[in-house]
């Protein structure tokens, strides 16, 4: 079958935009670290890169293949306010490269980390 | 308390990057439409904009305040392959602007849409 060039171009564009790659996401710091309900962070979220997007098959999963660690400084506020906001430095994993891996490879990778 | 200018700059930067705004997300088309298990799409996902990010308080929610409508063409493939890929057109709402709204405002907005 012959398909319109425009359709093929737009489909190719969609492939590129939705591929498995590091994507900027917002992490809610309080939720991520499960802090006490009277502890708040300002800003409440940080921006980090995590692998995301779609793989070409059900049996594949978008997984990180390399990671760097970032430190970010936020203000921590404890209620009731007995003192002002305290600067705290928190370390976050940043995914720097990703790959569509078979779920079996993912299982192997996780287990090799556990065995280390 | 006096805080280091660098700390304040990086915190301000984090606020900006994590604020409530339209963000590109990948939607798995097959999952979205809950299609038959032998129906596949190429590409499997489309890129759309949805409101996301963090609001400054628990009682606020990041919601869209304006929307535009887009159409994208993909290929549908039915297995076993007795015929070639067929083009399908998907229409959806793209969030074009967002605001942190109180959950009460969100409730009112949803109900005003239902009543229309």
């Amino acid at each position: 079958a012959h398909y319109n060039t425009e359709i093929l171009k737009s489909i190719d564009n969609e492939w590129r935009k939705t591929q498995c790659m590091p994507r900027e996401v917002c992490i809610d710091v309080g939720k991520e670290f499960g802090v006490a309900t009277n502890t708040f962070f300002k800003p409440p979220c940080v921006s980090v890169y995590r692998c995301g997007g779609c793989c070409n098959s059900e049996g594949l999963q978008c997984m990180n293949t390399s990671t760097s660690y970032l430190s970010k400084t936020l203000f921590e506020i404890t209620v009731p306010l007995s003192q002002g906001p305290k600067p705290v430095t928190i370390s976050f994993a940043n995914h720097t490269s990703c790959r569509c891996m078979s779920k079996l490879d993912v299982y192997r990778q996780v287990h090799s980390i556990i065995r280390r | 308390a006096h805080y280091n200018t660098e700390i304040l700059k990086s915190i301000d930067n984090e606020w900006r990057k994590t604020q409530c705004m339209p963000r590109e997300v990948c939607i798995d088309v097959g999952k979205e439409f809950g299609v038959a298990t032998n129906t596949f799409f190429k590409p499997p996902c489309v890129s759309v904009y949805r409101c996301g990010g963090c609001c400054n308080s628990e009682g606020l929610q990041c919601m869209n305040t304006s929307t535009s409508y887009l159409s994208k063409t993909l290929f549908e493939i039915t297995v076993p392959l007795s015929q070639g890929p067929k083009p399908v057109t998907i229409s959806f709402a793209n969030h074009t602007s967002c605001r942190c709204m109180s959950k009460l405002d969100v409730y009112r907005q949803v109900h005003s849409i239902i009543r229309r």
Partner: nanobody
Framework: EVQLVESGGGLVQPGGSLRLSCAAS????????MGWYRQAPGKQRELVSA???????LYADSVKGRFTISRDNSKNTVYLQMNSLRAEDTAVYYC????????????WGQGTQVTVSS
Amino acid sequence: EVQLVESGGGLVQPGGSLRLSCAASGSSFSPYAMGWYRQAPGKQRELVSATSEGGFTLYADSVKGRFTISRDNSKNTVYLQMNSLRAEDTAVYYCYMHWRGSDPENYWGQGTQVTVSS
């Protein structure tokens, strides 16, 4: 047990219109997605149109501009308005509904015959 019942099929002349409907009974929840497949004699079942709670709508290019899908959540019903019908639209039309997280997630109707012929 969820059951889907289709209606509205029949014999129509080329250029004519039909409105199919499909109602679900046995569930108090609205399905997340609903849609229509069709199967012509000797051919594979193909997706015609679908709609989701996420605000997405899908049409096969062969029916785009002629068919319109709509849903009524209060009645757990999906409709397919078919205009400017052609001989190649002749098929058995099956509706499906998809509940996220249920088991099974998808339920199917028994099919309704649409014949376009002069």
